[in-house]
Interface confidence: low
């Protein structure tokens, strides 16, 4: 029967003589006159069994004491802790020459747990043990006893077990306790990886590499490894595990996130409170659900609040200038909780008689700076038709508008364009050139913007640089310009007029009159 004694967590005791109740019953050789089992009191006045020998008067002592068989339990190296007293030979009169102050420690590996005899030749010597501080017995009555403690190790061991033996060669010794143990690195959790009880290696310098296994609800980041050192200490942790999404580290474990909390990824972060406008109803949430009417954009992190589309822009003002419209507005009262707000312009052309019959304006209308994705709160719309009803909608949009589009997100205004001057004439041609005249013809403007009342032709000698020009007006789309000088370059411009006024002049047409009577007929833009 063995009693329980407390030893370090990294030591596993195989034998403790002080925990044995009753006689130890180890084998001594010789049976008589050598080692003797004796009861003494320990430092706590508890009776313990010891082995003593004190044959210091006789020469050539060779007294052996052998333990029972000790299982090694898979250990390759074991440690022997011996607590003993050793009489100082100087304190014993008349023993010079025969008294010794050392004893020898031996071991013998064996698979047989019932060997009955000591065979000295089978034992291998571990060490000669000497006291660090030999004691002199002063007063046996006051129970003062200087214990020497020596620890030796032996290995590598390979058999199922072993015997220890103590050889006395003529000392005065009391073995007070013998403890045999091996060292292990105890089960531990490091970096969320569990490392099992690991017996130390065979050599005093060896390191045993151990792979850890991730604790529940965690996963490897880098392969977790540690080294079990010969002294039973874990060394050099490498790699680690991370709590899975929905779990956080607490006291070396991965606990599920509480209700109302979440964790999106396998990281070493803690669970976070659900962002605004979201909630979780289960433990272990990896994301939070958005409240009704709130949304997350595809590229929104789980940590971002849920948001909603913006309200409509405010204070829309229009300013019509003939066939252009400038629109200006204010930001919505509610941006939906997002920064990525922008504006889209929708243009509809509506009939004068029935405003409900509207069609998209088409590609001929131009928007400055752009029609969609506007970051500013103003836009200029040009190239509209004159005397036409237009409805413009300004939509406020953000990253979640697509999840819940609603008319509440836009504001509109209806305008009528004014009469506008005609556009410029695209093509002017010289149809006939003589020494004194040029016959011109041109096309109607692309956008007359009303009834063309007349055309105005402006011309001048090229050398005069428009300082002295003449005007000819005509209702037709052609005219003969007469009274010109021969062999002279002229520049011609044509523009149209409506009730709204003149349009822009055409691009210049340069023509040189002839030097001979014959006529040159052509339709190029430049005739010579």
């Amino acid at each position: 029967v063995t009693g329980s004694r407390v030893y370090p967590a990294n030591e596993v005791t195989l034998l403790d003589s002080r925990s044995v109740q009753g006689e130890l019953g180890w084998i001594a050789s010789p049976l008589e006159g050598g080692w003797e089992e004796v009861s003494i009191m320990d430092e706590k006045n508890t009776p313990i069994r010891t082995y003593q020998v004190c044959n210091v008067m006789e020469a050539s002592q060779n007294n052996w004491l052998r333990t029972d068989w000790i299982t090694r339990e898979g250990a390759q190296r074991v440690y022997i802790e011996i607590k003993f007293t050793l009489r100082d030979c100087n304190s014993l009169p008349g023993v010079m020459g025969t008294c010794k102050e050392t004893f020898n420690l031996y071991y013998y590996e064996s698979d047989n747990d019932k060997e009955r005899f000591i065979r000295e030749s089978q034992f291998g010597k571990i060490d000669t043990i000497a006291a660090d501080e030999s004691f002199t017995q002063v007063d046996i009555g006051d129970r003062i006893m200087k214990l020497n403690t020596e620890i030796r190790d032996v290995g590598p061991l390979s058999k199922k077990g072993f015997y220890l033996a103590f050889q006395d060669v003529g000392a005065c010794i009391a073995l007070v306790s013998v403890r045999v143990f091996y060292k292990k690195c105890p089960l531990t959790v490091r970096n969320l990886a569990q490392f099992p009880d690991t017996i130390t290696g065979a050599d005093t310098s060896s390191l045993v590499e151990v792979r850890g296994s991730c604790v529940n609800n965690s996963e490897e980041k880098d392969v977790p490894k540690m080294y079990c050192g010969a002294d039973g200490e874990w060394l050099v942790p490498i790699g680690n595990c991370l709590c899975n999404a929905g779990h956080e580290e607490q006291n070396g474990e991965c606990q599920a996130c509480k209700i109302g909390y979440y964790k999106a990824l396998s990281t070493d972060a803690s669970c976070a409170k659900c962002p605004p406008h979201s909630y979780s109803v289960w433990e272990g949430a990896t994301s939070c659900t958005c409240d009704r009417g709130f949304f997350r954009a595809d590229n929104d992190a789980a940590s971002m609040p849920c948001t909603r589309p913006p309200s409509a822009p405010l204070n829309l003002i229009s300013n019509v200038n003939e066939t252009s419209v400038n629109l200006e507005w204010s930001s919505p009262q509610n941006t939906g909780g997002r920064q990525d707000i922008s504006y889209n312009v929708v243009c509809k052309k509506c009939g004068a008689g029935d405003p409900s019959k509207c069609r998209p304006c088409g590609s001929g209308v131009h928007y400055t700076p752009q029609q969609n994705g506007l970051k500013t709160t103003r836009v200029s719309i040009t190239d509209l038709l004159a005397h036409t009803n237009y409805t413009f909608e300004i939509w406020a949009v953000n990253g979640v508008s697509k999840y819940n589009p609603s008319p509440d997100q836009s504001v509109s205004v209806t305008v009528t364009t004014n009469q506008a001057a005609p556009s410029s004439i695209a093509l002017v041609q010289a149809k006939e050139v003589t020494r004194y005249s040029v016959a011109l013809a041109w096309l109607e403007p692309d956008r007359p913007n009303g009834v063309i009342l007349e055309y105005e032709v402006k011309y001048y000698e090229k050398d005069q640089n428009e300082r002295s020009y003449r005007i000819v007006r005509t209702a037709a789309r052609n005219t003969d310009i007469k009274g010109l000088n021969p062999l002279t370059s002229y520049v011609f411009h044509v523009r149209a007029r409506t009730a709204a006024g003149y349009g822009d002049f055409s691009e210049p047409l340069e023509v040189t009159t002839n030097t001979v009577p014959s006529r040159i007929i052509g339709d190029g833009a430049n005739s010579t």
Epitope: E109, E120, S121, Q122, F123, G124, K125, I126, D127, D153, V154, G155, P156, L157
Partner: antibody, heavy 124, light 107 residues
Framework: QIQLVQSGPELKKPGETVKISCKAS????????MHWVKQAPGKGLKWMGW????????TYADDFKGRFAFSLETSASTAYLQINNLKNEDTATYFC?????????????????WGAGTTVTVSS | DIQMTQSPASLSVSVGETVTITCRAS??????LAWYQQKQGKSPQLLVY???NLADGVPSRFSGSGSGTQYSLKINSLQSEDFGSYYC?????????FGGGTKLEIK
């Protein structure tokens, strides 16, 4: 590198004394005990005993008790074998060899380094 | 004392052959055995320790085996540099006796 260097050959007459040396280098002298091995001409190896380099305590095999003495000069990392009252049968080569001083299991017990040997010839 | 009986005492073989030398202890020596090779006029060199462990730098054609009282040294595909004498030695309680030796000669 680790080596054991032995003294040169000796020619002696019966009854004389010879002292041969074994100088260690390349390691801590007191970490290894020194052993002596005899090899008579054309014969095998015979273990003579050893000396504890820490304590200077010699141990002799039965056949080598009496006329043989092991000694040390620790400061010079040198072990000595002295044979007194030489006999013809002492004619042999004597080797020194080292082994770890403390026993840490059978896997570590072997003579890993030997001296080159010293030949002693005893002839009248 | 433990006696070590080595056999054969001598052996005449050709290069490329395989040879086995045996060593018997008078009692169980628990694999506490070493093998050495000795060339003429040289000191012994360690080949095998603890019965089966090959010493550093020893070619893999050498191998040791055995337990209890019976041990052997095997040399596969003998090379010319392998000729010489071979000795076993126990380390199980002093005196640490050697075997009588085996002389390996070229045929």
């Amino acid at each position: 590198q680790i080596q054991l260097v032995q003294s040169g050959p000796e020619l002696k007459k019966p009854g004389e004394t010879v002292k041969i040396s074994c100088k260690a280098s390349g390691y801590t002298f007191t970490d290894y005990s020194m052993h002596w091995v005899k090899q008579a001409p054309g014969k095998g190896l015979k273990w003579m005993g050893w000396i504890n380099t820490e304590t200077g305590e010699p141990t002799y095999a039965d056949d080598f008790k009496g006329r043989f003495a092991f000694s040390l000069e620790t400061s010079a990392s040198t072990a000595y074998l002295q044979i007194n009252n030489l006999k013809n049968e002492d004619t042999a080569t004597y080797f020194c060899a080292r082994i770890p001083l403390y026993y840490y299991g059978s896997r570590y017990w072997y003579f890993d380094v030997w001296g080159a040997g010293t030949t002693v010839t005893v002839s009248s | 004392d433990i006696q070590m009986t080595q056999s054969p005492a001598s052996l005449s073989v050709s290069v490329g052959e395989t040879v086995t030398i045996t060593c018997r202890a008078s009692e169980n020596i628990y694999r506490n055995l070493a093998w050495y090779q000795q060339k003429q006029g040289k000191s012994p060199q360690l080949l095998v320790y603890a019965a089966t462990n090959l010493a550093d730098g020893v070619p893999s054609r050498f191998s040791g085996s055995g337990s209890g009282t019976q041990y052997s040294l095997k040399i596969n595909s003998l090379q010319s540099e392998d000729f010489g004498s071979y000795y076993c030695q126990h380390f199980w309680g002093t005196p640490w006796t050697f075997g009588g030796g085996t002389k390996l000669e070229i045929k």
